[in-house]
Amino acid sequence: SERCDDWGLDTMRQIQVFEDEPARIKCPLFEHFLKFNYSTAHSAGLTLIWYWTRQDRDLEEPINFRLPENRISKEKDVLWFRPTLLNDTGNYTCMLRNTTYCSKVAFPLEVVQKDSCFNSPMKLPVHKLYIEYGIQRITCPNVDGYFPSSVKPTITWYMGCYKIQNFNNVIPEGMNLSFLIALISNNGNYTCVVTYPENGRTFHLTRTLTVKVVGSPKNAVPPVIHSPNDHVVYEKEPGEELLIPCTVYFSFLMDSRNEVWWTIDGKKPDDITIDVTINESISHSRTEDETRTQILSIKKVTSEDLKRSYVCHARSAKGEVAKAAKVKQKVPAPRYTVELACGFGAT
C-alpha cells in the first residue's frame, strides 16, 4: 500500500466514555492535525475510513457498521455508538485518503463502568467556583450534538449520590446548576444525567465534574511575605549553618503563576559562587490560597557571607513584593576567665 502520513497514537486524547451510553467521537485529524475541515476534505474527493484495534490485540480490523439498530455508525467526521459496550475499548484509527493523498491518526477509546453513585475510573474535569461571590453556575458538559434542538431532554442533577432537590443554595435549572452561594460545603462531584428519546429508544448521558470552591478575586491581595521579617535577626558565627526561610502567602487567583525567589547581593543564587541550596515546599488552604516556603541554606557560612544582602522576592498576578532578611555576624561572647579577670586587676 502507498505511503500514508501517520500521526501515530494520539494519547493526549485519551477518550473515556460510559458503558451503555451514546458516544460521539470526532476524528481528531480535523481538530488537531490538518489545516482543513471535513467538509473541505469531502468536497475535494477524500474519503474518511475508520478501523480499530481491540484491547490487548495487535490486529487492525474494520469497524462493523452493520450491527443491529446501527449500534455503531459514522456521520461525516463523527463515529457514533448508540450505545457503547464494554468491549468497544481499544485504539481507533481514522484515515483520510484518496488515490494520491493519505493521512491517519489513532486514539485510545476506553469504555468505563460506573456504579449507582456515578463512581468510576473516569478522569473528571474540575470547575472552580469563587467562595461567597454571588450567583455562579456550572453547565452539564459535552452534550452538544447528541440530539437536535427540537428534542427537549430531561436533566437530573446529583451531588455525589443524592438528587439535588430543595438543596437550599444549589438550584438545578435544566442544563445549568446555579449556586446562590458557593461554600466549602459545596465541594464535591456533581453529575448531570441527560435523558432523551431517539427513534423510539431512550438514551442517557452521564456527565460528572468536580466542583472546587476557591478564593474570591474580590478578596485577592498581592503576595504577603511572612518571613523574613523585621522581628527575626539571623545572627551566626562563621562556620555555622545559615538557614533563612522565605514564607509567602498567595491569594488564589485563577491562572496566576506564583513565584518565589531569593537574591544574594542582587543576583540569583545560581549566578554566584557560594555554596547555597534552596528547598521549596508548597501548601494550600481549603480555598486554594497557597503558601510557598523557600529555605535558603548555606552549610558553612563565612564572615563574607554574613555581610551579604539576602532578599526574598515574590510575584503573582496581583503584584510583586520583596523583603530583606536581617543577617549579622554574632559578636563572640567574652571569655570569662581571661577578660573578666583582667578587668578586676588580677595578676
Epitope: Y130, E132, Y133, G134, I135, R137, T139, N166, N168, N169, I171, P172, E173, G174, N176, S178, L180, I181, S216, K218, N219
Partner: antibody, heavy 120, light 110 residues
C-alpha cells in the same frame, strides 16, 4: 427585632437624582443574603429593580430597564439605591427586601417602603 | 427577560371557598417561583417559595404546585384575612440573572 427600614423618598422634579437608603437591624449583611429593591407604582403591581450580593464581592443584578440609570450599593448594614434622571414613571413606593441564598432564594424579609414622587 | 402572567387578574370568592390562582412564565423557570400576599398599605408577605415550600408561619391552607412554566397557588378554604392581592414571582439564575413579578390577582369578597 429583624427588620428593614427604607428612607430617602421625596417629591422631586423630572431629571433630578435621589438616593434611597434601607437600614437593616437585627441581622447583619452577610454572605448568606442578597439585598434587593422592588418598586410599586400607585395602584399597580410589583416590579423588580435590582439586587446586590451582601458578601464581599458585592455582585450586582439589574432589571434591563434600570441599567445605567439606577445603581445599587451597600455598606455593612445599609442598602442604597441611587436613582438618576428621574422620570414621572419612576413614581412609586420603593421597597427593599432580603433574599436568603441559603433557603432557595426566598425573599423572606421586606421593608415598609418609601414613596418617591417625580412631578413638576 | 422573563415575563410572568397571572390569571385571573381578580376574583370574587366567599369564606370557605377553594381558590386557585395560576401563573405562567415566558420560559422554563425550573420551580424558582414564589407567591406573595399583599394588603393595602403593607409590604408583600412571602407565602410559598421554590414553587411548593411553605414559608415560616404561613397557614397550611396555602399550597403551591407546578413546574416548568406553569404554577398554581391554592387556598384550600378561604378565610376573612385572606382577602388581599397575590403576586407570583419567578427567578432565572442561569444566563442573565433576573427576577420578575406577575401583575397580581386581587381576591375580593363575593
Amino acid at each position: 427585632q429583624v427588620q428593614l427600614q427604607e428612607s430617602g423618598g421625596d417629591l422631586v422634579q423630572p431629571g433630578a437624582s435621589l438616593r434611597l437608603s434601607c437600614a437593616a437591624s437585627g441581622f447583619s449583611f452577610s454572605s448568606t443574603y442578597y439585598m434587593c429593591w422592588v418598586r410599586q407604582a400607585p395602584g399597580k403591581g410589583l416590579e423588580w429593580v435590582a439586587c446586590i450580593y451582601a458578601g464581599s464581592s458585592g455582585s450586582t443584578y439589574y432589571a434591563s430597564w434600570a441599567k445605567g440609570r439606577f445603581t445599587i450599593s451597600k455598606n455593612s448594614s445599609t442598602l442604597y439605591l441611587q436613582m438618576n434622571s428621574l422620570r414621572a414613571e419612576d413614581t412609586a413606593v420603593y421597597f427593599c427586601a432580603r433574599v436568603d441564598g441559603s433557603s432557595s432564594g426566598s425573599w423572606d424579609l421586606w421593608g415598609q417602603g418609601t414613596l418617591v414622587t417625580v412631578s413638576s | 427577560a422573563i415575563q410572568m402572567t397571572q390569571s385571573p387578574s381578580s376574583l370574587s370568592a366567599s369564606v370557605g371557598d377553594r381558590v386557585t390562582i395560576t401563573c405562567q412564565a415566558s420560559q422554563n423557570i425550573y420551580s424558582n417561583l414564589a407567591w406573595y400576599q399583599q394588603k393595602p398599605g403593607q409590604a408583600p408577605k412571602l407565602l410559598i417559595y421554590a414553587a411548593s415550600l411553605l414559608a415560616s408561619g404561613v397557614p397550611s391552607r396555602f399550597s403551591g404546585s407546578g413546574s416548568g412554566t406553569d404554577y398554581t397557588l391554592t387556598i384550600s378554604s378561604l378565610q376573612p384575612e385572606d382577602f388581599a392581592t397575590y403576586y407570583c414571582q419567578g427567578a432565572v439564575y442561569s444566563g442573565n440573572t433576573e427576577w420578575a413579578f406577575g401583575q397580581g390577582t386581587k381576591v375580593v369578597i363575593k
